[in-house]
Interface confidence: medium
């Protein structure tokens, strides 16, 4: 099995993870994608997935979480807003293609974040973010919630990741067409 | 409906310890942050610790650390709160709570919904 | 840690009036406050978070105002059912303290 590496990126509260996972176009291109949490020693758990089948550029947001597919290019664009100390862990991206396991985008996202200059909990004092709550809806979640932790045996290139700032925050009022799924039951 | 159901009243010996479940129905668990919060007869509100159980990771207010030790089992939606070496003034009742999430803030949208509260009383 | 000071501690009104209930940070919180209201034997429950937002199905009447270091909660014309034990919480840093409580009592 690949060796698994990991990427580290240092963020503020408030500020906006913004990776961009690459895959084989034609291979994966409608496939399936999803953001996971690796926690030690348990399985890897999805937090947000793509439809099946996976539309190009269409934003598909839960909580925090939106992603978007980008088809014509190979890569999954993940953003997690408004970061809070909380959410501070082990990520990786996935694509769906059962019966099979799980095919894994390396690498894997070591996220830090920690307290802006107002320290508060996913917030930075400048941010002009809003909190918000979304009401609980029953529609049902679009991907299995756990998957195999086993390793891939061929690596894809490796994922990218941007750094916004509070200031460059996604208003998320202005994501068009957001399908909201609980994927935590 | 959200419900948390905790479990019933203790009764423990001082230098015992107890520990208090907290079961989350009608709704998502490990999306959500649990905290526990206590209050002595006749007193306020003490904030004791809080997990997000899709983390697993826990914070505890100093004054007790290293005597709370808050946990959560995501396959039954059961968050615990275990409180060792019980003297007189731990007796209270015990409150689980939860608040925020991926919607949101973790914390920032404040406890939601309340456990109806568990009575620890520790007399010898 | 974080020091919430609520004030008054009792406050005697009579149904109609308008009250006004203080809490003071020891520093600064930004909005990160949430106001619950606590009946004798039951859970708190909560009615403002982020300081000023009105919590789903609470009475308008309800409301919130200040950030940094001030703030307060106001109920602008006082109901029976209003008659209990308000609390303030800081969401700033951890622990997530609480103020001493102020009892609303009839007059």
């Known amino acids: 099995a690949t060796k698994l590496t990991e990427e580290k990126y240092e963020l503020k509260e408030g500020q906006t993870l913004d990776v961009k996972c690459d895959y084989t176009l034609e291979k994966f291109a409608s496939s399936q994608k999803a953001w996971q949490i690796i926690r030690d020693g348990e399985m890897p758990k999805t937090l947000a997935c793509t439809e099946r089948p996976s539309k190009n550029s269409h934003p598909v947001q839960v909580g925090r979480i939106i992603l978007e597919d980008y088809h014509d290019h190979g890569l999954l664009r993940v953003r997690m807003v408004n970061l809070q100390v909380e959410d501070s862990g082990l990520y990786q991206c996935v694509i769906y293609q059962p019966p099979k396991e799980p095919h894994m985008l390396f690498d894997r996202i070591r996220l830090v974040v920690t307290k802006g200059f107002s320290g508060t909990p996913g917030s930075n004092e400048n941010s002009t973010q809003n909190v918000y709550k979304i009401p609980p809806t029953t529609t049902k979640a679009l991907c299995p919630l756990y998957t195999s932790p086993r390793t891939v045996t061929q690596a894809p290139p490796k994922s990218t990741a941007d750094v916004s700032t509070p200031d460059s925050e996604i208003n998320l009022t202005n994501v068009t067409d957001i399908i909201r799924v609980p994927v935590f039951n | 409906q959200v419900q948390l159901v905790q479990s019933g009243a203790e009764v423990k010996k001082p230098g015992s310890s107890v520990k208090v479940s907290c079961k989350a129905s009608?709704?998502?668990?490990?999306?959500?942050?649990i905290s526990w919060v206590r209050q002595a007869p006749g007193q306020g509100l003490e904030w004791m610790g809080s997990?997000?159980?899709?983390?697993?990771?826990?914070n505890y207010a100093q004054k007790f650390q290293g005597r709370v030790t808050i946990t959560a089992d995501e396959s039954t939606s059961t968050a615990y709160m275990e409180l060792s070496s019980l003297r007189s003034e731990d007796t209270a009742v015990y409150y689980c709570?939860?608040?925020?999430?991926?919607?949101?803030?973790?914390?920032?949208?404040?406890?939601?919904?309340w456990g109806q509260g568990t009575l620890v009383t520790v007399s010898s | 840690d974080i020091q919430m000071t609520q004030s008054p501690s009792t406050l005697s009104a009579s149904v109609g009036d308008r009250v006004t209930i203080t809490c003071r940070a020891s520093?600064?919180?930004?909005?990160?406050l949430a106001w619950y209201q606590q009946k004798p034997g039951k859970a708190p429950k909560l009615l403002i978070y982020?300081?000023?937002s009105l919590e789903s199905g609470v009475p308008s009447r309800f409301s919130g105002s200040g950030s940094g270091t001030e703030f307060t909660l106001t109920i602008s014309s006082l109901q029976p059912d209003d008659f209990a034990t308000y609390y303030c919480?800081?969401?700033?840093?951890?622990?997530?303290?609480f103020g001493g409580g102020t009892k609303v009592e009839i007059k």
């Open positions: 709570a939860r608040s925020g999430g991926y919607s949101s803030s973790w914390y920032g949208t404040g406890y939601d919904y």
């Open positions: 009608g709704g998502t668990f490990s999306s959500y942050a």
């Open positions: 997990i997000i159980p899709i983390f697993g990771t826990a």
């Open positions: 520093q600064s919180i930004s909005s990160w």
């Open positions: 982020k300081a000023s």
């Open positions: 919480q800081q969401f700033q840093s951890y622990p997530f303290t």
